[in-house]
Interface confidence: medium
Amino acid sequence: MEIPMSTVVKETLIQLSTHRALLTSNETMRLPVPTHKNHQLCIGEIFQGLDILKNQTVRGGTVEILFQNLSLIKKYIDGQKEKCGEERRKTRHFLDYLQEFLGVMSTEWAMEV
Amino acid sequence: MEIPMSTVVKETLIQLSTHRALLTSNETMRLPVPTHKNHQLCIGEIFQGLDILKNQTVRGGTVEILFQNLSLIKKYIDGQKEKCGEERRKTRHFLDYLQEFLGVMSTEWAMEV
């Protein structure tokens, strides 16, 4: 049975806490950190940073599950991205989607007022 | 004086409603509409669809302001994207950003439970 993605994300948050000391054991490493809170625009950089971190982290044990989960999350996001242009629909459907996007942007994005 | 982006987005939402009839006058046009509600992953496709719509819409009058605003929003998003990899910081700052991203994903994204 496939684990729901919402569960994977919640588990990953817990694992991140658990492995914080291990993940920060290399104090000299520098990773890309966006300068704003619109995380959704920076997914590429987040996973690029994770690849660097993975390669620099002592492997084995339960930290492997953390990296496996992060890999599942990336796979899920890539799958969602593929669905972006999958369907061609009437203009009114497109406008509904645009309206929703702007609504989300208006209420949930970190923008200067 | 530069208009805050939050104001531009709110205005654009109003203009979209106002010009709905004009924008949907071409019944044969088909545009890319994502099959999920994680709009933030589909920004490329949204603005690609807008380019098609712009080229197919009778220009002039107040609809011009709508397209100008949508162009400003695209410019803002592109600017935000550029800031994604602008800074290189300590692992702990990167982990905080990752933690926040997963937190947002967990609470705000449309995922199967």
Epitope: H19, A21, T24 | H93, D96
Partner: antibody, heavy 119, light 107 residues
Framework: QVQLVQSGAEVKKPGASVKVSCKAS????????INWVRQAPGQGLEWIGY????????RYNQKFKGRATLTVDKSTSTAYMELSSLRSEDTAVYYC????????????WGQGTLVTVSS | DIQMTQSPSSLSASVGDRVTITCKAS??????LSWIQQKPGKAPKTLIH???RLIDGVPSRFSGSGSGQDFTLTISSLQPEDFATYYC?????????FGQGTKVEIK
Amino acid sequence: QVQLVQSGAEVKKPGASVKVSCKASGYTFTNHHINWVRQAPGQGLEWIGYINPYNDYSRYNQKFKGRATLTVDKSTSTAYMELSSLRSEDTAVYYCARDYGNFWYFDVWGQGTLVTVSS
Amino acid sequence: DIQMTQSPSSLSASVGDRVTITCKASQDINSYLSWIQQKPGKAPKTLIHRADRLIDGVPSRFSGSGSGQDFTLTISSLQPEDFATYYCLQYDDFPYTFGQGTKVEIK
């Protein structure tokens, strides 16, 4: 519950060394950094440094580098702060504090250890 | 080192008063700021982290705001148990540095 219990008060002579302990319980010791902070009588707080119990990596405030040594004993879940070449201005209460797993703030503090340096 | 300048150094207030304490960093600290409360003879206690995030169990009358270099701690309605010294702490860069403290006394 999560607790940090520190060793008792110490009186030392100038030039001597002191080693303060901080015993952790109620959580996985290697998962959280331990910070050390001191407070001279009637003064504010001053950060000495931190140690990552996972790999014994420590980071010091330059002011204490060479005089402060942070160590851990994983088998007893205990962190130690040793301060050498003591002088009267080192008279202070020394606190250990745990970094919370997310976002680095100090979520649990020890009760403090008073170190008095006097001839 | 990053300097943290807190003001005022002390203030007198009455129960029910709204109290504001400010903290200025000598450089941008990316919201890596916490507010710490200390009562006489007791260990410090963290109230707020990341500039505005209230820690579980801390009363909602405490709130934090600010980003970059300027930060504020507000107690909306001062209670008898709030009379203490408050410190800001930056943990954006090493060495972590504290403000000099603000003593909140009973008027």
